[in-house]
């Protein structure tokens, strides 16, 4: 369960990929869509507001009954869209949507490599957003691989302002 | 109970070898960050090498790097740093430690170990 | 790398009074800062995580606030077992930094 409905903290960001490639959302047909793409050097990146909750581990899962503790994020590009995950289309899309938000809006956060991060799906243990085709999908992650694969992580730049509502 | 306790410390020449272990209880060690941090006898705090959870990725800081290795054994919830080539300056307190957060080091470490000293000297 | 920059270095105060302890990171972190408390011999105890977040079973009188790069240790009322040195450090990014510790002493 998620500790509480207020975040913790909240912070300004863009999001990249490892390689460096941009995460940008731009309205089409009155959704928006999500692209992986090279910026060119004078277009400003997209922000994102993530939204840090935390939450209790199921003890069967962790080992460690009430002691641990998840860090869970929700990624809002545009005021009242959230990233979310569609478990069945294996895909991650852009949603209007009134708080609370549903559980397929939150994602695990990972520090998987050394100051890159990873969201794996709250609604979906072993699956993450990942890099696919120049879009974001869903990707299923053995854990019996060494998890460094580098289509699941991401960097995140924060952008020093103090608003948190955005575009 | 969530326990964290160090082992192998001691007195050891300059070019010398020691592994530290870091036997935990009480959680799986493979779903946190683990940390190594030292601290020289009245001084502050120094971070050492840190190991990523479930990926195993592994951290050090420069003035240790290729000649430390931490690693661990998920079979013996136990993690390990293997000191080598010790120097002089290597003399701390050697703490291990563990995140908040399953997964993440965003929120710092919140259980520790009690520390093993490490002397090396001739 | 990040530097933490923390002051002061040590600080003769009584019981009762009100501590306030500051750092500056180098560059900006959000809100990903830890503050610590350590008596000698002993390790580290987490008290506050996340800037502002109290650790579980720490006395409410700690409070923690800042983001970006200037963050601050409030402690409202000491009492006689916070005597101690208390270091900050950043958890935003690798090496995660230590400031170089506040030393509260009796006066």
């Known amino acids: 369960s998620i500790t509480g409905i207020s975040p913790i903290t909240e912070s300004l960001a863009s999001l990249s990929t490892y390689n460096d490639q941009s995460i940008t959302f731009a309205l089409e047909d009155e959704s928006y869509e999500i692209y992986v793409e090279d910026l060119k050097k004078d277009k400003k990146k997209d922000k994102v507001l993530l939204s840090y909750y935390e939450s209790q581990h199921p003890s069967s899962e962790s080992g460690d009954g009430v002691d641990g503790k998840m860090l869970m994020v929700t990624l809002s590009p545009t005021k009242d869209f959230w990233l979310q995950a569609n478990n069945k289309e294996h895909s991650v899309e852009l949603h209007k949507c009134e708080k609370p938000l549903p559980d397929q809006a939150f994602f695990v956060l990972h520090n998987r490599s050394f100051n890159c991060v990873s969201f794996e799906c709250k609604t979906d243990p072993g699956v993450f957003i990942g890099v696919k085709d120049n879009h974001l999908a869903l990707i299923k992650v053995d854990y019996s691989e060494n998890l460094g694969s580098e289509n699941i992580l991401f960097k995140l730049s924060e952008i020093l302002e103090h608003h948190h509502h955005h575009h | 109970e969530v326990q964290l306790v160090e082992s192998g410390g001691g007195l050891v020449q300059p070019g010398g070898s020691l592994r530290l272990s870091c036997a935990a209880s009480?959680?799986?060690?493979?779903?946190?960050?683990m940390t190594w941090v030292r601290q020289v006898p009245g001084k502050g705090l120094e971070g050492v090498s840190a190991?990523?959870?479930?990926?195993?990725?592994?951290y050090y800081t420069d003035s240790v790097k290729g000649r430390f290795t931490i690693s661990r054994d998920n079979s013996k919830n136990t993690l390990f740093l293997q000191m080598n080539s010790l120097r002089a300056e290597d003399t701390a307190v050697y703490f291990c430690?563990?995140?908040?957060?399953?997964?993440?080091?965003?929120?710092?470490?919140?259980?520790w170990g009690q520390g093993t000293l490490v002397t090396v000297s001739s | 790398d990040i530097q933490m920059t923390q002051s002061p270095s040590s600080v003769s105060v009584s019981v009762g009074d009100r501590v306030t302890i500051t750092c500056r990171a180098s560059?900006?972190?959000?809100?990903?800062l830890a503050w610590y408390q350590q008596k000698p011999g002993k390790a580290p105890k987490l008290l506050i995580y996340?800037?502002?977040s109290l650790q579980s079973g720490v006395p409410s009188r700690f409070s923690g606030s800042g983001s970006g790069t200037d963050f601050t240790l409030t402690i409202s009322s000491l009492q006689p077992e916070d005597f101690a040195t208390y270091y900050c450090?950043?958890?935003?990014?690798?090496?995660?930094?230590f400031g170089g510790g506040t030393k509260v002493e009796i006066k």
């Open positions: 450090q950043q958890t935003n990014s690798f090496p995660l930094t």
């Open positions: 996340v800037a502002s």
């Open positions: 190991i990523s959870g479930i990926s195993g990725g592994t």
């Open positions: 430690a563990r995140t908040v957060y399953s997964s993440s080091y965003y929120g710092g470490f919140q259980h």
């Open positions: 009480g959680f799986t060690l493979r779903s946190y960050f």
């Open positions: 560059q900006g972190i959000s809100s990903w």
